[in-house]
Interface confidence: low
């Protein structure tokens, strides 16, 4: 079943290569198990950046080696991507799946364009 997911259109990553945005999904009831997937679209190619499953009574937990972190509150998920470089500029799409209880719902946002500007190297100091 279809579900609406909303996310900001544009986000500028910090000089340290960190970008955060909120992904909000429309839900008629309380889902016990929610899966959030971050996808990066470059041209016609779509790749998975990271994914996490969380529950209403638990914190959003990405794998230890993931480039993403996040927190959840109700039907909002605050996602943070780390280690971004200029080549990481692109459209990042938030996909939300309400896994449990039935029925299953899935929603995809329109994407957040993340702009990453690599910092200028510091000049050597004598």
């Amino acid at each position: 079943k279809g579900m609406h997911a909303a996310q900001p259109a544009v986000v500028l990553a910090s000089s340290r290569g960190v970008a955060s945005f909120v992904c909000e999904y429309g839900s008629s009831g309380n889902a016990a198990e929610v899966r959030v997937t971050m996808l990066r679209q470059a041209g016609s190619q779509m790749t998975e950046v990271c994914a996490a499953t969380y529950t209403v009574e638990d914190e959003l937990a990405f794998l230890d080696d993931s480039t993403c972190t996040g927190t959840s509150s109700g039907n909002k998920v605050n996602l943070t991507i780390q280690g971004l470089r200029a080549m990481g500029t692109g459209l990042y799409i938030c996909k939300v799946e309400l896994m449990y209880p039935p029925p299953y719902y899935v929603g995809m946002g329109n994407g957040t364009q993340i702009y990453v500007i690599d910092p200028e190297p510091c000049p050597d100091s004598d």
Epitope: A32, T53, T55, D58, Y100, P101, P102, P103, Y104
Partner: antibody, heavy 121, light 107 residues
Framework: QVQLQQPGTELVKPGASVKLSCKAS????????MHWVKQRPGQGLEWIGN????????RFNEKFKNKATLTEDKSSSTAYMQLSSLTSEDSAVYYC??????????????WGQGTLVTVSA | DIQMNQSPSSLSASLGDTITITCHAS??????LSWYQQKPGNIPKLLIY???NLHTGVPSRFSGSGSGTGFTLTISSLQPEDIATYYC?????????FGGGTKLEIK
């Protein structure tokens, strides 16, 4: 009240298949996932997989992916598990179990009586 | 898969005793652990969910605790009807896995 009815026993020959049933009553069948659990005689419990009765979606323990097929029939509120290419290792009690969403989606609050499958020539 | 190691595998205690069964997970499962009781010839019965929550109708002499990788089930004032095998089960990630069981006997 919630009830999960399973036939008591099934005697099958090695290499054959068997289809176990679990008839649910006392609740809305499509609102809760149904799980299947294996218990060999005198042994512990093993989770086989589950089915979402609202759309037929399944999840499996990899160990049972080529052994078990889970289906459902919404019209009769019945979940099915077919076991194929049976060997003596498949002789066990098979339970269907339902989670209790109100008290945690991963826990099995309701169990069928179990079907004893005996594989013997 | 997450491995669930239960100890002891068997336990003998006297009526009125307080006993503890432990369950160790091979990786962090937060509080997503449940305990079941299975009496001889019977079906498993849910006792505790989410580590410490008592399921409806379960006597208060049963209690659970723990988080992360270490969990305990405590039965205080042991009763004759507590003779059973007890299993822990993790609900953190698929496939759900059970401990090997602890068989409780009365001395």
């Amino acid at each position: 009240q919630v009830q999960l009815q399973q036939p008591g026993t099934e005697l099958v020959k090695p290499g054959a298949s068997v289809k176990l049933s679990c008839k649910a009553s006392g609740y809305t069948f499509t609102s809760y996932w149904m799980h299947w659990v294996k218990q060999r005689p005198g042994q512990g419990l093993e989770w086989i997989g589950n089915i979402n009765p609202s759309n037929g979606g399944t999840r499996f323990n990899e160990k049972f992916k080529n052994k078990a097929t889970l289906t459902e029939d919404k019209s009769s509120s019945t979940a099915y598990m077919q076991l194929s290419s049976l060997t003596s290792e498949d002789s066990a009690v098979y339970y269907c179990a339902r989670s209790n969403y109100g008290s945690g989606w991963a826990w099995f609050a309701y169990w069928g009586q179990g079907t004893l499958v005996t594989v013997s020539a | 898969d997450i491995q669930m190691n239960q100890s002891p595998s068997s336990l003998s205690a006297s009526l009125g005793d307080t006993i503890t069964i432990t369950c160790h997970a091979s990786q962090n499962i937060n509080v997503w652990l449940s305990w079941y009781q299975q009496k001889p010839g019977n079906i498993p019965k849910l006792l505790i969910y989410k580590s410490s929550n008592l399921h409806t109708g379960v006597p208060s002499r049963f209690s659970g605790s723990g988080s992360g990788t270490g969990f305990t089930l405590t039965i205080s004032s042991l009763q004759p009807e507590d003779i059973a095998t007890y299993y822990c089960q993790q609900g953190q990630s698929y496939p759900w896995t059970f401990g090997g069981g602890t068989k409780l006997e009365i001395k």
